[in-house]
Amino acid sequence: LTCLGGFASPGPVPPSTALRELIEELVNITQNQKAPLCNGSMVWSINLTAGMYCAALESLINVSGCSAIEKTQRMLSGFCPHKVSAGQFSSLHVRDTKIEVAQFVKDLLLHLKKLFREGQFN
């Protein structure tokens, strides 16, 4: 994922409890990862800016048959105001860059932790 710095509000901003649950789920995924996550599937990288939750879902929804991220997909759909289906792409995708799901999750986790801290202290 790109644009880790200088991000705008990720709109819509989920309540801190829901954000905390999403972060906990991503932590579980990264900690419990033994074999390559989702068999090393590749997804489009995204810009971590406004609309990030929908963009993340649009990327991850194209990964099928990976039970490890199903809960994450469901949680992200709760943060995205519109229906997302496989093959859908927004301008937030960095269309020339694909990364492994494991790296996508790690980058998203790092960014969401920053958002959580921001929300806590501001």
């Epitope: 409890t17 921001e118 806590q120 202290f121």
Partner: antibody, heavy 120, light 107 residues
Framework: EVQLVQSGAEVKKPGATVKISCKVS????????MHWVQQAPGKGLEWMGG????????ASNQKFKGRVTITADKSTDTAYMELSSLRSEDTAVYYC?????FGGGPFAYWGQGTLVTVSS | DIQMTQSPSSLSASVGDRVTITCKAS??????LSWFQQKPGKAPKSLIY???RLVDGVPSRFSGSGSGTDFTLTISSLQPEDFATYYC?????????FGGGTKVEIK
Amino acid sequence: EVQLVQSGAEVKKPGATVKISCKVSGYTFTDYEMHWVQQAPGKGLEWMGGIDPETGGTASNQKFKGRVTITADKSTDTAYMELSSLRSEDTAVYYCTTGDYFGGGPFAYWGQGTLVTVSS
Amino acid sequence: DIQMTQSPSSLSASVGDRVTITCKASQDINSYLSWFQQKPGKAPKSLIYRANRLVDGVPSRFSGSGSGTDFTLTISSLQPEDFATYYCLQYDEFPYTFGGGTKVEIK
């Protein structure tokens, strides 16, 4: 190895202000929130406040009625806690503490403590 | 503010004993609870976070349990180095609050 090194002991007069520093190493300073905890002699632990070093946003305990100012200097990886209008009951050891909220908890690592004595 | 009521405030035990310390929150804290050990003149040391997760390097005789408002720290077989004061902390919401502490003394 994560390390938090605090400034040395201080003796202050009532009404004065004390500023304690906490220099960190072993992790990226902006990755974890930083908190300050007070422990009066023979007493328990009390959370004073904390800061997100990335943004400078703070939260503090109303018990200290605006006397606490917490800051962070990203250029030196150092956090500061300033306590003003000191009174005798502020005599205590002050700790800085940090950690990953989601991976060890926000108080996983502690400084060695700084004794502040308030006496006329 | 969330109140954390820790009990007992002190206890006497022997090496090898099973020791249980409890912490009760005034409202649901979503298991955002840590346990600390403190020895005289030293900074607290983190033992447990998220109610039941053991901090790296902490002996497995320490364990945490509970959810909602009621939490427990258990030392399965007390060792000489475990005589200390123990504190719980809720970090579910600001202001973060500690329990009053439990001093574990030698019987």
